[in-house]
């Protein structure tokens, strides 16, 4: 059973992930971003189901495409270079989902834009955080 300290750690990691995803969304969905219309041509795969931490496998598998989109953006829209930002997210995702169980991600048939993709995972983080508090 999870201890209160492990629950707190999970909550903090989710909050960190949430902030990173929100920062990316704000940097993209921004009047200062002249590349947005091109960014919206990128396809992202969405999870069929995202209700548990193990489903973060689906986010992990889409981090490389996410980095490619961010490479289009002007770096001043973000505090970090895309590679560093994605690397940070990857570390958090790996810790949260755990590496001991191998989960095969199932994707929905419909693909999504980067805005829809980020909103989906932001909602996921918020949902899990609410169950922990």
């Amino acid at each position: 059973a999870p201890t209160s300290s492990s629950t707190k750690k999970t909550q903090l990691q989710l909050e960190h992930l949430l902030l990173d995803l929100q920062m990316i969304l704000n940097g993209i969905n921004n009047y200062k971003n002249p590349k947005l219309t091109r960014m919206l041509t990128f396809k992202f795969y969405m999870p069929k189901k995202a209700t548990e931490l193990k489903h973060l496998q689906c986010l992990e598998e889409e981090l490389k495409p996410l980095e490619e989109v961010l490479n289009l953006a002007q770096s001043k829209n973000f505090h970090l270079r895309p590679r560093d930002l994605i690397s940070n997210i990857n570390v958090i995702v790996l810790e949260l989902k755990g590496s001991e169980t191998t989960f095969m991600c199932e994707y929905a048939d419909e693909t999504a834009t980067i805005v829809e993709f980020l909103n989906r995972w932001i909602t996921f983080c918020q949902s899990i955080i609410s169950t922990l508090t």
Epitope: Y31, K32, T37, L40, T113
Partner: antibody, heavy 126, light 108 residues
Framework: EVQLVQSGAEVKKPGASVKVSCKAS????????ISWVRQAPGQGLEWMGW????????DYAQKFQGRVTMTKDTSTSTVYMELRSLRSDDTAVYYC???????????????????WGQGTLVTVSS | SYELTQPPSVSVSPGQTARITCSGD??????AYWYQQKSGQAPVMVIY???KRPPGIPERFSGSSSGTMATLTITGAQVEDEADYYC???????????FGGGTKLTVL
Amino acid sequence: EVQLVQSGAEVKKPGASVKVSCKASGYSFTTYGISWVRQAPGQGLEWMGWISAHNGNTDYAQKFQGRVTMTKDTSTSTVYMELRSLRSDDTAVYYCARDGYHYGSGSYDNAGFDHWGQGTLVTVSS
Amino acid sequence: SYELTQPPSVSVSPGQTARITCSGDALPRKFAYWYQQKSGQAPVMVIYEDSKRPPGIPERFSGSSSGTMATLTITGAQVEDEADYYCYSTDSGGDVSVFGGGTKLTVL
């Protein structure tokens, strides 16, 4: 009703410049971007670049870098596309097109060019 | 430079299904958009994000994408659908915005 109304046809000599206008109405001008697309006679469509109607940020196709300038005038809800050092192969119909993304709201009517101007024929001839 | 390849022409009889393809190496990870241009007129978007139909576009227009190929399908083509059709997308890095060469649809 969303409308983009462009300026009239132009005839220019090689080496000259042309400035085409596109006046928007029927929507909140500053929350959408405008792209410019051209079409040479009997040819396909070619994307030239984009301008934010909010702050004038631009994104030009590499082919036109240094030769094109896109500007906007919020007071008249008008965007402009100026092309310099004209050559005969710049003879084309030039279209402005609204990008369907609604900035700031995180939503869009549809990504892509959802409303187009009627086109402006620019003829470059000596 | 990145290219989207379309067949120059497609012909169908009224009521038949017309399929127009668009091929590009980046399409597995890029959305395709489709524009209809009737003679002497400005283009009109008929499909965005591979398969979504804008308001006012008839249901007979549909889109799909698989691998490096996007397809515009007109089920029960009508005489008024006769036009040039262009696909649009970007290259793998998103740096280059490209239209396909266009397909002339003839509804005989």
